[in-house]
Interface confidence: low
Amino acid sequence: LPAQVAFTPYAPEPGGTCRLREYYDQTAQMCCSKCPPGQHAKVFCTKTSDTVCDSCEDSTYTQLWNWVPECLSCGSRCSSDQVETQACTREQNRICTCRPGWYCALSKQEGCRLCAQLRKCRPGFGVARPGTETSDVVCKPCAPGTFSNTTSSTDICRPHQICHVVAIPGNASMDAVCTSTSPTRSMAPGAVHLPQPVSTRSQHTQPTPAPSTAPGTSFLLPVGPSPPAEGSTGD
């Protein structure tokens, strides 16, 4: 570059490169300014005028310094089994993640394409491995001496109460029933719950497609219809 500060647009030295936040425009053969995040190139540079940038319109964004003619469209709004963990702004795309009680069975570059409800372990089975954001719950049969009487994605097998005199012996899905003398327990009483995060959407109980199902278009995030028409003033 020349010794003095060069203002865009300028011609780079032979074999030279443009500076940070500049790009080389092949048509003008000049180094020109990029547009900042949240904006796009409204008018490309010429030999005598620099790039003209303009703000992204609603529901569009650019995340990086750029010289794109149009901003990128934000993804469609989060489906009903998801929560919006990052809103659509002029500088970032919306990110949807599965709501609590669900996990991502089919991921995409950002967020999740298909959420599936966490498996619930039925009575006689307890949680062997809790669900994560990207993996389902693993259930296991309750071992002798333990039980689970719930249908739950969080409850583990609990030990039977220890009776002085057993009225009804416990099994995998039922605790032991003692005679009137007070029982003891080999571990702390009550169901053991694995922690669940708080949701901003209701926890639905409807079944969802199993993650093993080959994903069809019905599982994709819906592309909403076109936006409602603006009134006479617009923004």
Epitope: D58, C74, R77, C88, R201, Q206, G224
Partner: antibody, heavy 118, light 110 residues
Framework: QSVEESGGRLVTPGTPLTLTCTAS????????MIWVRQAPGKGLEWIGY?????ITDYASWAKGRFTISKTSTTVDLKVTSPTTEDTATYFC???????????????WGQGTLVTVSS | ALVMTQTPASVEVAVGGTVTIKCQAS??????LAWYRQKPGQPPKLLIY???KLASGVPSRFSGSGSGTEYTLTISGVQCDDAATYYC????????????FGGGTEVVVK
């Protein structure tokens, strides 16, 4: 495009009642729908949503008292055991269906009147 | 629970005047707010969504503003036809919600 409610009538307390919202000119597999009611001289009271994928959300007070379901062209609201407090005009409405601005309703029916009286 | 509080409950305004209706959310709703107008015997009509965007066919004398938890509907150059009840509605979440609608504001035009 339109929505139209039907099924409103005079019922005695405890008699189950199903209201139907019929959609014309658009697909219920694409749009979310809402049921809202309005008691005489009162404000709008949300009952519940049914999302395009069939999943439902209810107002906390409405859980167990109402059930929303749908077919390809209708959205039904079942009032499981009506009381006199359920006397109201019941509206269904369609979500604007656009991602950017949250959940709003641009297409409303004229409403159907339910009177619960012994 | 997320609660929408609308004020005032009733307001009187002269033809040609300006009326302001406020809506407060008990937590931030990120501009996910709509305003509706309802006349007696009719269903609500969407006026504004996204806190400030006019719905199709709505005249420019209606405007919406606000962010976070505080939102405002302003009607300037009020006409007789604007006599109605106006409702705000949060479009942010359906979790832990009794009613996404505010209680309503009756606008009386003198």
């Amino acid at each position: 495009q339109s929505v139209e409610e039907s099924g409103g009538r005079l019922v005695t307390p405890g008699t189950p009642l199903t209201l139907t919202c019929t959609a014309s000119g658009f697909s219920l597999s694409t749009y979310d729908m809402i049921w809202v009611r309005q008691a005489p001289g009162k404000g709008l009271e949300w009952i519940g949503y049914i999302w395009s994928d069939g999943i439902t959300d209810y107002a906390s007070w409405a859980k167990g008292r109402f059930t929303i379901s749908k077919t390809s062209t209708t959205v039904d609201l079942k009032v499981t055991s009506p009381t006199t407090e359920d006397t109201a005009t019941y509206f269904c409405a369609r979500d604007v269906g656009y991602a950017g601005y949250g959940y709003y309703f641009d297409l409303w029916g004229q409403g159907t009147l339910v009177t619960v009286s012994s | 629970a997320l609660v929408m509080t609308q004020t005032p409950a009733s307001v009187e305004v002269a033809v040609g005047g300006t009326v302001t209706i406020k809506c407060q959310a008990s937590q931030s709703i990120t501009n996910y707010l709509a305003w509706y107008r309802q006349k007696p015997g009719q269903p609500p009509k969407l006026l504004i969504y996204g806190a400030s965007k006019l719905a199709s066919g709505v005249p420019s004398r209606f405007s919406g503003s606000g962010s976070g938890t505080e939102y405002t509907l302003t009607i300037s150059g009020v006409q007789c036809d604007d006599a109605a009840t106006y409702y705000c509605q949060q479009g942010y979440t359906s979790s832990n919600v009794d009613n996404p609608f505010g209680g309503g504001t009756e606008v009386v035009v003198k």
